[in-house]
Interface confidence: low
């Protein structure tokens, strides 16, 4: 809390300008009118105030707007945004994408802070859904943003927004999140032809069911091992050796290097050894020839 002291003669700020960087903290408190500050916030970001000076400016705005800042002020906060607490931000009503971009720019290059997370939450809730422009903006600043959302939150993403998603945006998503995103991606890309479709859908396949993988195996897609290793184990297990061979194409040889890792390991355990032998890769651990193979899905249906 800054003490209330009278402004020295001749130091009353008539404008927000660079000369204010030469004011001591108490002078800023005494000589800068909060309303003037609010109307000239666009200048503050271009003035090299110290963190201590920014504290004083924030204090003045807090006094002027105890219920939360108006968007006209928020849009021009600049470095002052770094001084805001999540509690401050919860009082805001941010509706403009330009405001969101301006504040994300301030935090650019850093991890998502609690302030930024709160800001995004307020913004998205205010809009009611994660529209394409918002998602474009958020993933541009935070490639991992999508994967930080819960499956429930992801359910509000409209299929049209999926066009904004880049492969790297999904790197840290877990299967539960991909389960939600995959059907949206399928819908978004449904009018594309085979090869183009596969390029777009590839990043989302961690949420694909068995029947879609079977369909892809008929389309000469040549899925790479990295994508295959991210598939749901329960979706891979029912695939036949022939289907996996078609799905992977020339990449099938990579199965040998991954034979001890899921989902390859579990898939091998479900295949007849003589079927695996047809691949000529030396994959071991399949069901020995002559053994009865129960269709586990059928068994579950009967029980």
């Amino acid at each position: 809390e800054v003490e209330k002291t009278a402004c020295p003669s001749g130091k009353k700020a008539r404008e927000i300008d660079e000369s204010l960087i030469f004011y001591k903290k108490w002078e800023l408190e005494a000589c800068v009118d909060a309303a003037l500050l609010a109307t000239q916030m666009d200048r503050v970001n271009a003035i090299p105030f110290t963190y201590e000076q920014l504290d004083v400016l924030k204090h003045k705005l807090d006094e002027l707007y105890p219920q939360g800042y108006p968007e006209s002020v928020i849009q021009h906060l600049g470095y002052l945004f770094l001084k805001m607490s999540p509690e401050d931000i919860r009082k805001w009503n941010v509706t403009s994408l330009e405001t969101l971009k301006a504040l994300l720019e301030v935090n650019k290059g850093h991890e998502m802070s609690p302030q930024v997370a709160t800001l995004i939450d307020r913004f998205v809730k205010g809009r009611g859904q994660l529209d394409k422009d918002t998602l474009d903006t958020l993933t541009a600043f935070y490639p991992g943003y999508l994967c930080s959302l819960s499956p429930e939150e992801l359910s509000s993403v409209p299929p049209s927004s999926i066009w904004a998603v880049r492969p790297q945006d999904l790197d840290t998503c877990d299967p539960r999140q991909l389960d939600v995103l995959y059907p949206k991606a399928r819908l978004a890309f449904q009018n594309m032809n085979g090869s183009e479709y596969f390029v777009k859908i590839q990043s989302f396949l961690g949420g694909a069911p068995t029947e879609d993988l079977k369909a892809l195996s008929q389309q000469n897609v040549s899925m790479d091992l990295a994508t295959f290793m991210k598939l749901r184990t329960d979706a891979v297990l029912p695939l036949t050796v022939a289907e996996v061979q078609k799905l992977l194409g020339p990449h099938v040889e990579g199965l040998k290097a991954e034979e001890r890792h899921r989902p390859v390991r579990d898939w091998i355990l479900r295949q007849r050894q003589d079927d695996l032998d047809t691949l000529g890769l030396g994959l071991q651990g399949g069901i020995p020839n002559g053994y009865l193979v129960l269709d586990l899905s059928m068994q579950e249906a009967l029980s």
Epitope: I21, F22, D42, R43, A46, I47, P48
Partner: antibody, heavy 121, light 108 residues
């Protein structure tokens, strides 16, 4: 790229008026302060004042207050330095320079090439 | 006004040598609000160091700034032929901002 381009050299007589210019490009001109710096022949640098082009708010060094006028036309990203009545002692190289941004600013990070003003009868 | 005094006025060195330039302020320059500029004959100044020790974009690592309070130093670890120029310090802590009178680094 970010640059400031100044108008060409001027030769004037004492008592004449003059307005030199500094055009910014490659960045958002209205979002940075522009300062003017004088360098007399064989001498060092002297800070004259600055302007916020967005609304043309200016501030001057006490040594130059009332001697020169700093202005800007944001529509053409140009700042100006002008004299209403030149003196021989105004003979110098004049530089415009951009203030660096935000907390890391205050220093002059981009400079114009300079405008040489010669005042002689 | 804060007066900045640079020393020496001239520094005569050979390429490869280390150059140490001093800038002393008449009163404390707080928050490290001090910059260094390089100026070659017929050219505009160029920002080298801001915040007393931070190198500006594109400035070679051989340039380094240090100091606080009233004493600041610009060091060029190993002089290259293109480093022979005049160097100015500037404070932007007190109003108005002021420059030192400059140190000329010349070839010995």
């Amino acid at each position: 790229q970010v640059q400031l381009v100044q108008s060409g050299a001027e030769v004037k007589k004492p008592g004449e008026s003059l307005k030199i210019s500094c055009k910014g490009s490659g960045y958002s001109f209205t979002n940075y302060w522009i300062g003017w710096v004088r360098q007399m022949p064989g001498k060092g640098l002297e800070w004259m004042g600055f302007i916020w082009p967005s609304d043309s708010w200016t501030s001057y060094s006490p040594s130059f207050q009332g001697q020169v006028t700093i202005s800007a036309d944001k529509s053409i990203s140009t700042a100006y330095l002008q004299w209403s009545s030149l003196k021989a002692s105004d003979t110098a190289m004049y530089y415009c320079a951009r203030y660096g941004h935000g907390m890391y600013g205050g220093a002059l990070d981009v400079w114009g090439q300079g405008t040489l003003v010669t005042v002689s009868s | 006004d804060i007066v900045l005094t640079q020393s020496p006025a001239t520094l005569s060195l050979s390429p490869g040598e280390r150059a140490t330039l001093s800038c002393r302020a008449s009163q404390s320059v707080r928050s490290s609000r001090l910059a260094w500029y390089q100026q070659k004959p017929g050219q505009a100044p160029r920002l080298l160091i801001y915040g007393a020790s931070k190198r500006a974009t594109g400035v070679p690592a051989r340039f380094s700034g240090s100091g606080s309070g009233t004493d600041f130093t610009l060091t060029i670890s190993s002089l290259e032929p293109e480093d022979f120029a005049t160097y100015y310090c500037q404070q932007y802590y007190d109003f108005p901002p002021t420059f030192g009178q400059g140190t000329k680094v010349e070839i010995k």
